[in-house]
């Protein structure tokens, strides 16, 4: 068990052109929240899938009000760490998503507004108990700087928080085969639960349920002493017939240490001394490289051949972010002015304007619209000092509260009769005409002009226009 800790250092405009406007305005202050989601392994799961390792939310950030005319600075951050407790072993490799949310404060139509300012994601290798790792991620024009670490909760220790530590029973040394718990030198590593019956004096285990023998002992439970009187070598697996040690491989034979690590034998097994940038029992854990496949969504990884050199993901069209983890969010360019809420609908951008503003990008300041709302999706537009609504299809009236008569525009051609219907309008065509709006003449021989009448409808039947 342990805790993943995230410290946000700064959130603000990234370097280069296209600096974002401040997310808050003088008229409408706001504050930020950060949300972190963790998943085990180098997961390719969608951002919306459950946070299997855990999730956490920051405290509320301080209220921030933009200074008119000033560039967007780094924004005031919530106090404290984001902490994600984990109950089981730390997986070593994990995926993270960090979201920055904005809460607009103050009275406004439709209630308080929440919006996602930025979402960054990545995949990392991290050993528990190690130092803080620093990171910078960009989302659109925003830049997030943060540090993170995983630490074990006592009595757990180790790079996966699977080893247990207990206070020493004797003041000077730990029990047979047990190491001091660095950095807690006054504690000793507690034995794992080995195979039932495994000799506590002559056996040990590195994985639960196994039983490995110290030198001089053999058998499934390490209870059989090995005779060395007529042996050539002082180590090796026991011969089934003589009980004598025959030459066998030592724990460092073949060098189990990866990535250039050097091996040294210990009374229990072996120990690897790892080169810079690697860690783990066999120096198998390193910084993320292109070999780890850090680029999502078909991104091309370049560089990063070794842990000390950075990799770069070249993203395919439609994706962005340090790891191509983010669909291009056109809202990140903040196209909606005057505090409008941006919605990326896929096929189009939509700006939901605050009261007092209108236009496709909320660019029109409508003092006469302030505090007024147009119902049913209508838009308030400037009307020479008077409040006027441009109503969505099917609605009319000063505030778009009245259902418009769909027949008012006389949509039925060639003398067809129009009937209002709950789903639109219906045209009853005059003899000799057909179609949704009676636009097609029926030929004298009974064949209609294109398009043909749908099955089951005779020419001249009323046709519903949806």
């Amino acid at each position: 068990a342990g805790v993943f800790e995230l410290q946000i250092h700064s959130f603000g405009p990234g370097p280069g052109p296209g600096a974002p406007r401040s997310p808050c305005s003088a008229r409408l202050p706001c504050r930020l929240f950060f949300r972190v989601c963790l998943k085990p392994g180098l997961s390719e799961e969608a951002a919306e899938s459950p946070c299997a390792l855990g999730a956490a939310l920051s405290a509320r950030g301080p209220v921030y009000t933009e200074q008119p005319g000033a560039p967007a600075p780094d924004l005031p951050l919530p106090d404290g760490l984001l902490q994600v407790p984990f109950r089981d072993a730390w997986p070593g490799t994990f995926s993270f998503i960090i979201e920055t949310w904005r809460e607009e404060l103050g009275d406004q139509i439709g209630g308080p507004a929440w919006s996602l300012l930025a979402r960054v994601a990545g995949r990392r290798r991290l050993a528990a108990g190690g130092p803080w790792a620093r990171d910078i991620q960009r989302a659109g024009a925003w830049e997030l700087r943060f540090s993170y670490r995983a630490r074990c909760e006592p009595p757990a220790v180790g790079t996966a928080c699977t080893r247990l530590c207990r206070p020493r029973s004797a003041p000077s040394r730990c029990g047979p085969g047990l190491r001091p718990c660095a950095p807690l030198e006054d504690e000793c590593e507690a034995p794992l639960v080995c195979r039932a019956g495994c000799s506590p004096e002559h056996g040990f285990c590195e994985q639960p349920g196994e039983c490995r023998c110290l030198e001089g002992w053999t058998g499934p439970l390490c209870t059989v002493p090995v005779s060395t009187s007529s042996c050539l070598s002082p180590r090796g697996p026991s011969s089934a017939t003589t009980g004598c040690l025959v030459p066998g491989p030592g724990p460092c034979d073949g060098n189990p240490c990866a990535n250039g690590g050097s091996c040294s034998e210990t009374p229990r097994s072996f120990e690897c001394t790892c080169p810079r940038g690697f860690y783990g029992l066999r120096c198998e854990v390193s910084g993320v490289t292109c070999a780890d496949g850090p680029c999502f969504n078909g991104g091309l990884c370049v560089g990063g051949a070794d842990p000390d050199s950075a990799y770069i993901c070249h993203c395919p069209p439609g994706f962005q972010g340090s790891n191509c983890e983010k669909r291009v969010d056109r809202c990140s360019l903040q196209p909606c002015r005057n505090g409008g809420l941006c919605l990326d609908l896929g096929h189009a951008l939509r700006c939901r304007c605050r009261a007092g503003f209108a236009g496709p990008r909320c660019e029109h300041d409508l003092d006469d619209c302030a505090g007024r709302a147009c119902a049913n999706g209508g838009t308030c537009v400037e009307g020479g000092g008077a409040h006027r609504c441009s109503c969505a299809l099917g609605f009319g009236g000063r505030d778009c509260r009245e259902r418009a008569d769909p027949c008012a525009a006389r949509p039925c051609a060639h003398g067809g009769r129009c009937y209002a219907h709950f789903s639109g309008l219906v045209c009853a065509c005059a003899p000799g005409y057909m179609g949704a709006r009676c636009e097609f003449p029926v030929h004298p021989d009974g064949a209609s002009a294109l398009p043909a009448a749908p099955p089951g409808l005779r020419p001249g039947d009323p046709q519903r226009y949806l």
Epitope: F33, R35, E48, S49, P50, A55, L57, W101, E103, Q108, I109, G110, G111, P112, A113, W114, S115, L116, C331, L341, C342, L343, R352, G377
Partner: nanobody
Framework: QVRLVESGGGSVQAGGSLRLSCAAS????????MGWFRQAPGKEREGVAT????????AYADSVKGRFTISQDRAKNTVYLQMNGLKPEDTAMYYC??????????????????WGQGTQVTVSS
């Protein structure tokens, strides 16, 4: 997709209480916002109370502040609306709604994509 089923509506005298429940199923992990809305006959649908599911933040319409409380049980994927001090003007069809989008006005029904079928609340004087 997210499926929402409301329950707990009914008839009550003015000053009484009701507790509405909204059980969510489907891709509930993607719903950032859940709330209660109501529509009285001949009136527009209006926001009553909403919460940010992962932040324990709430918003209430002025007309219900101090009387209604929205809460959730994450383990059961259920959102509740405790309604105390009910008034005849609270009579309406109450709908549960959810939004998975990343920009929401908490009491604006136009920003919520998923809706239940509704449960009727009638308050008599």
């Amino acid at each position: 997709q997210v499926r929402l089923v409301e329950s707990g509506g009914g008839s009550v005298q003015a000053g009484g209480s009701l507790r509405l429940s909204c059980a969510a199923s489907g891709s509930t992990y993607s719903t950032n916002f859940m709330g209660w809305f109501r529509q009285a006959p001949g009136k527009e649908r209006e926001g009553v109370a909403t919460l940010v599911t992962w932040a324990e933040r709430t918003a209430y319409a002025d007309s219900v502040k101090g009387r209604f409380t929205i809460s959730q049980d994450r383990a059961k994927n259920t959102v509740y609306l405790q309604m105390n001090g009910l008034k005849p003007e609270d009579t309406a069809m109450y709908y549960c709604a959810a939004a998975a989008s990343t920009a929401v006005r908490l009491l604006d029904p136009g920003d919520f994509a998923y809706w239940g079928q509704g449960t009727q609340v009638t308050v008599s004087s």
